[in-house]
């Protein structure tokens, strides 16, 4: 196990996981931990605990190793971080790599305010609710960009989109957090479409899908440990 | 679906030696990482050492030097000696496995693990 020092002089390495950093429960996921060509063992990091190593062999020149998780579930469900060892030295720690699980418990319901179908610049709400009290609620959009917002609450989430713009148009889904990492099935697909201005932009995103592989996320880590465009919006509501 | 089950567990003066296996059904035990665990009277489940898909091995500090992890594919079972055993390691040890796995990972945390088996109680008394 890795021995803390106050001479980590080697570059932290970057981890990111693969297909997505959410997980339905019970899937596998990947995570990847990218050091060094020289690297000779690596370390893979649970919510601080010591969770799994790689040594790579030396006959694979590879700056990187993959650690497997084979089944996903609450109890595997949280940060990581990496490290790795060249020589003498361990690297420093790698940004943390949040993740979540999904499809636990129940399903939530999400609808637009005041119709799916807009006009640009018009007000736009979405909704979320779930019978299970939860105290977070989270509105992700299909191939969206990074944009994050907390409150807290209850069973219902309040999602104020403000005046509409083309970039809002496209496929969203909602979730409730049982924890940050522990999130419901999610909801049924509400696509939110934009008439007006310029062009017309009514049409619905080039190639949508109910699929969560689809989604594309950034699965590596800015320097403030936020998940660099991960597409979700974090919402709680308050009562 | 893995099954596992302990056995060779059972009563054993200090210093003395004992070796733990652990059977696993099914044709996915080549592809798995495995582990041993051991839960004193007490106190919460303790990793003990894991070997890897390719025989890379781990041990926890208070059995490096004394216990000795391995596998047998071809009899689908993992084993664990045991020597220069202490009263502090008495405990039900389980096996765990991680089905499937990849390349050379050894898995430290219990969170990792998807199959355990029933466990077998080792007791080291004068």
């Known amino acids: 196990q890795r021995i803390n020092t106050e001479k980590e002089t080697l570059p932290k390495p970057i981890i990111w996981a693969k297909p997505s950093i959410m997980v339905t429960n019970g899937n596998s996921v990947n995570i990847w931990c990218q050091g060094a060509q020289s690297a000779s063992e690596y370390q893979l990091y649970f919510e601080g605990s010591f969770f799994a190593l790689e040594r790579p062999k030396p006959s694979r020149s590879m700056n990187k190793v993959r650690f497997f998780i084979s089944q996903m579930t609450s109890h595997t469900a949280g940060i990581y971080t990496c490290f790795y060892q060249s020589g003498e030295l361990w690297s420093k720690s790698s940004n943390p790599l949040k993740l979540v699980v999904t499809g636990l418990y129940d399903t939530p319901n999400l609808w637009v305010y005041p119709r799916p179908e807009v006009t640009l610049g018009e007000n736009v709400t979405f909704f979320c609710q779930l019978k299970t009290a939860t105290s977070k609620f989270f509105l992700l959009k299909e191939r969206g960009s990074n944009h994050i917002q907390n409150k807290y609450g209850n069973i219902q989430a309040e999602f104020p989109m403000g005046p509409v713009t083309r970039a809002h148009r496209g496929t969203y889904r909602c979730f409730g957090s049982y924890n940050d990492y522990a999130w419901s099935f999610p909801s049924e697909p509400v696509t939110l479409l934009i008439t007006g201005g310029v062009e017309n932009s009514s049409l619905a995103p080039t190639d949508p899908t109910s699929s969560l592989d689809y989604w594309e996320f950034d699965l590596s880590t800015n320097e403030s440990g936020l998940q660099k465009d991960s597409a979700f919006w974090d919402h709680t509501t308050q009562n | 679906e893995v099954q596992l089950v302990e056995s060779g567990g059972g009563e054993v003066q200090p210093g003395g030696s004992l070796r733990l296996s652990c059977a696993a059904s099914g044709r996915t035990f080549a592809s798995a990482a495995m582990g041993w665990f051991r839960q004193a009277p007490g106190k919460g489940r303790e990793f003990v050492a894991a070997?890897?898909?390719?025989?890379?091995?781990y041990y926890a500090e208070s059995v490096k030097g004394r216990f000795t992890i391995s596998r047998d594919n071809a009899k689908n079972t993992l084993y664990l000696q045991m020597s220069s055993l202490r009263a502090e390691d008495t405990a039900v040890y389980y096996c765990?496995?991680?089905?499937?796995?990849?390349?050379?990972?050894?898995?430290?945390?219990?969170?990792?693990?998807?199959?355990w088996g029933q466990g077998t109680l080792v007791t080291v008394k004068p």
């Open positions: 070997i890897s898909r390719s025989d890379d091995t």
């Open positions: 765990a496995a991680v089905v499937p796995t990849y390349g050379n990972n050894i898995y430290v945390h219990s969170a990792a693990y998807n199959y």
